[in-house]
Interface confidence: medium
């Protein structure tokens, strides 16, 4: 059975403070404990969460934690359930609020000798006790002709007089704590002899040379004095006007009239009312000169038929703020319909081709008028003037494919070759009218081409196949000078292509026939065994019916290919001694020898005193140093052939002989000793 060792109990709690509803359970099996609030499961939050079986509150909330809590224990296996006693919180709280006018309904209705009631909006539980203050001084019951109940939230002043004027605040306290008003109330009950505003002057905006009028009236008993001042504190009267206010008139009712306003008249005007008692009342109003700036330019716009588009007109800066309207063909646009004005926007709903044209945004205020045109183009889908045609283009020459279309605005044309966009380069050029030029047509240009002509309204496309008319040419052209190895088999290839497969044959340049050991097999000149006599000039001739013939001249040289008689060996030399790297090659023509040391060619004319290359090709290095170590390559070459062989050179310190080494002990590595 499930047994509650500790059950939750109802308790006092403070708003925003910690609390804990205890619950402890004893049971034999796997028990799952959870909490209900007014019958609904309680979900863990950072503020309220289960701690073991108990429910912990990091900060009690009078709204979220009001209600009945219950601890529920459930056996996950048997389904047995036990519920604790109900528990709830008595939450103590206090919350600040403003001082508000309860009676009369508005401040404007407060008159001397009327009753005024203020209300303190501080709430709490338990019910708070209130204290009122005027200008920070506590008020007590019956004090200075006011009725106050300190336990109540209302303060009544009956009747209210000028002596009650001041800043009213309240504080309240209960078992939770204390709070004071969040916003206080200023009570102002005027003295009849004080100047009071009847009519205040307003800011005005006027155009240059127009007139401006400021109205100003005060009341008091006895009647107050009224005076006008301009910015520099100069008084304005009908008898003494400042030089820049020659055209100013002050009327008996207090109004000030300015005629033929100039920029220097712009500024702050002060109307001052002075009663028999009390401070002067100063009212200000500003005279602004109307102005309007220029409007920004519009970019031309391109729209598609059937769409909805908007063009926003940014009004120019101006005083007063300029009004804005749109016109088309001199007619002001309506505020509804298919083409209409909405705020500062020109709206074109379901655009038609006929909507194209110039629209004008107008802006105007007292200072004048500005206008700006926007050119609207309604895009159309391109139509064909000339589609690309299947074409035969000659290899090596320029070729043209046409794609001529018309639309509004002028269409853009792009070309694709084998579905790949053609970007203009040295071989491809797209003209303004859409024609594609292929410079120097090549065989692999024979494929599909597609042109797409587009405007914002849509696009059209067409494709054409290009067939390249191949020129008669050698593929590849034979090398003009070639070598053959004496006494060996040799082949000299010659192949060509054209519109028709060409016939290929070889001739000797002097017109003599080929010897019997030389055969011409489908363009390949075959020497079974090369003799000295096979050297000479040969011509490869390729021909077909439609394109005629082409010739390639080849000079064949017979040579004995290079072999090395002596090759350099891996050599180790003591520092300071002389190294000899031998190299001898043979061949016909007689090969020349060059040496490469440490990845650079050794120039015989710039070797210096330590190095020397002998006539037979050997390389000698005197007084060797460690930096001479490295790989040395002997290169033998003639007009037909080049061969190389390499060997490393090691430069080492001469070892000091040890006792154990007899005089006959060989050095530990192969040496050249000098």
């Amino acid at each position: 059975a499930i047994v509650f060792i500790k059950q939750p109990s109802s308790q006092d709690a403070l708003q925003g403070r910690r609390a804990l509803l205890r619950c402890e359970v004893e049971a034999p099996g796997l028990v799952h404990v959870y909490w209900l609030l007014d019958g609904a499961p309680v979900q863990d939050t950072e503020r309220r969460f289960t701690q073991g079986s108990s429910l912990s509150f990091a900060a009690v909330d009078r709204l979220q934690d009001s209600g009945t809590f219950q601890c529920v224990a459930r056996d996950d296996v048997t389904g047995e359930e036990a519920r604790s006693a109900n528990a709830s919180f008595n939450i103590k709280w206090i919350e600040a609020g403003p001082v508000v006018l309860k009676h009369p309904a508005s401040e404007a209705e407060i008159q001397p000798q009327t009753q005024v009631t203020l209300r303190c909006h501080i709430d709490g539980h338990p019910r708070p006790t209130y204290q009122w203050f005027r200008d920070g001084t506590p008020l007590s019951d019956g004090q200075s002709n006011n009725t106050v109940s300190s336990k109540e939230r209302n303060l009544t002043l009956r009747p209210a007089g000028p002596e009650h004027s001041g800043l009213y605040s309240c504080c309240a306290h209960n078992a939770f704590g204390q709070a004071c008003s969040s916003q206080n109330f200023t009570l102002s009950i005027a003295d009849e002899s004080f100047a009071r505003v009847v009519l205040a002057p307003q800011d005005v905006i006027v155009a240059r040379n127009e007139e401006a009028m400021f109205h100003c009236q005060f009341s008091a008993q006895p009647p107050p004095n009224l005076q006008w001042l301009f910015e520099d504190e100069t008084p304005i009267t009908n008898r003494s006007r400042p030089p820049h206010l020659r055209r100013a008139t002050v009327f008996a009712n207090g109004s000030l009239l300015l005629t033929q306003v100039r920029p220097r008249n712009a500024g702050v005007y002060r109307c001052i009312g002075q009663g028999q008692r009390g401070p002067p009342v100063i009212l200000e109003a500003t005279l602004h000169l109307a102005e309007i700036e220029d409007m920004p330019l519009f970019e031309p716009r391109v729209f598609t038929a059937g769409s909805e588009e908007r063009v926003t007109c940014l009004p120019p800066k101006g005083l007063p703020e300029p009004s804005v309207w749109w016109e088309h063909a001199g007619v002001r646009l309506p505020t509804h319909g298919r083409v209409y004005q909405k705020g500062h926007e020109l709206v074109l709903a379901s655009i038609a081709e006929s909507d194209a044209g110039v629209y004008t945004c107008h802006a105007a205020n007292l200072a004048g008028q500005r206008r700006q045109d926007v050119n609207i183009t309604v895009a159309t889908v391109p139509t064909w003037l000339k589609k690309p045609q299947d074409s035969q283009l000659e290899e090596g020459k320029p070729g043209y494919l046409h794609c001529l279309t018309q639309a509004t605005p002028k269409p853009t044309v792009v070309w694709y070759r084998n579905q790949m966009l053609i970007s203009e380069d040295s071989r491809f050029e797209v003209f303004k009218n859409g024609t594609l030029r292929i410079n120097n047509v090549e065989v692999y240009d024979g494929t599909w081409y597609r042109c797409v002509s587009s405007t914002p309204a849509g696009s059209i496309e067409a494709q054409a196949r290009v067939q390249v008319l191949e020129k008669l040419k050698f593929t590849p052209p034979p090398q003009p000078q070639q070598c053959m190895e004496f006494d060996k088999e040799a082949t000299v290839p010659c192949s060509a292509t054209g519109r028709e497969k060409p016939t290929i044959k070889w001739e000797r340049a002097d017109g003599s026939s080929l010897p019997e050991w030389v055969t011409d097999n489908a363009g390949t000149l075959h020497f079974a065994r090369v003799t000295r006599d096979d050297a000479g000039n040969y011509t490869c001739i390729a021909s077909n019916g439609p394109q005629g013939q082409i010739r390639a001249h080849v000079q064949l040289t017979v040579a004995v290919f290079i072999t090395f008689k002596v090759e350099p060996e891996r050599t180790t030399v003591y520092q300071g001694h002389t190294a000899l790297l031998q190299c001898e090659a043979q061949g016909d023509p007689k090969p020349l020898i060059q040496w490469k040391g440490k990845d650079r060619i050794l120039d015989p004319t710039k070797l210096g005193p330590r190095m020397h290359i002998f006539q037979n090709g050997s390389l000698v290095i005197h007084d060797v140093a460690p930096e001479d170590s490295g790989r040395y390559t002997c290169i033998a070459g003639n007009s037909c052939n080049i061969k190389h062989t390499e060997a490393p050179l090691y430069v080492v310190d001469k070892p000091v002989p040890e006792e154990s080494e007899g005089p006959g002990s060989p050095p530990p590595y192969k040496m050249i000793q000098t």
Partner: antibody, heavy 123, light 112 residues
Amino acid sequence: QIQLVQSGPELKKPGETVKISCKASGYTFTTYGMSWVKQAPGKGLKWMGWINTHSGVPTYVDEFKGRSAFSLETSASTAYLQINNLKNEDTATYFCARSPFDYGSRGAWFVYWGQGTLVTVSS
Amino acid sequence: DVLMTQTPLSLPVSLGDQASISCRSSQSIVHNNGDTYLEWYLQKPGQSPKLLIYKVSNRFPGVPDRFSGSGSGTDFTLKISRVEAEDLGLYYCFQGSHVPWTFGGGTKLEIK
């Protein structure tokens, strides 16, 4: 005794929708939440999220937001998993598992499981 | 999300041997109420998973006492003192402290 019985296997094409049911018996349905767990063939277990049977509010793991939806038929003590716009990677066995509403004193999350429903998505 | 990493992936044992499976979390899985919701489940082929251990070390009723769980913070272990044939299958660790709840990748206990 407490049981969770799931609907039978489903063979679906990509783009279709599947709705799996999980019927609970042996306890008061609205006193425990219901979790859904996915197991792809030869793979491990993945918790998809759960539904609070008392309030009906579902909670989804980010990976399963969008195409998966948990729902209830409280009167029939049944929870449902619906997967829309099925993809090949939705091929898996889906388990329902009873889970408590909250973190309790001696609780475990998945004491009771359904037998699993195999959903195969293939074109 | 809390990543649960199980080692080894596969554990070949002889019947009667001791087996030990490790589970490591990518961050602490202590809940803000002080409890650690780390559970172990066993899944046999073609079956749904079964609860073995809850809250790190508590054996679920009916689970033999040869199964024990231990660990704290981020490192947890399931030990089987003497493996029996019925213990073979896939073992998963699971954390239920931080949403989204996550399972480990699984460890397959099989006969050598």
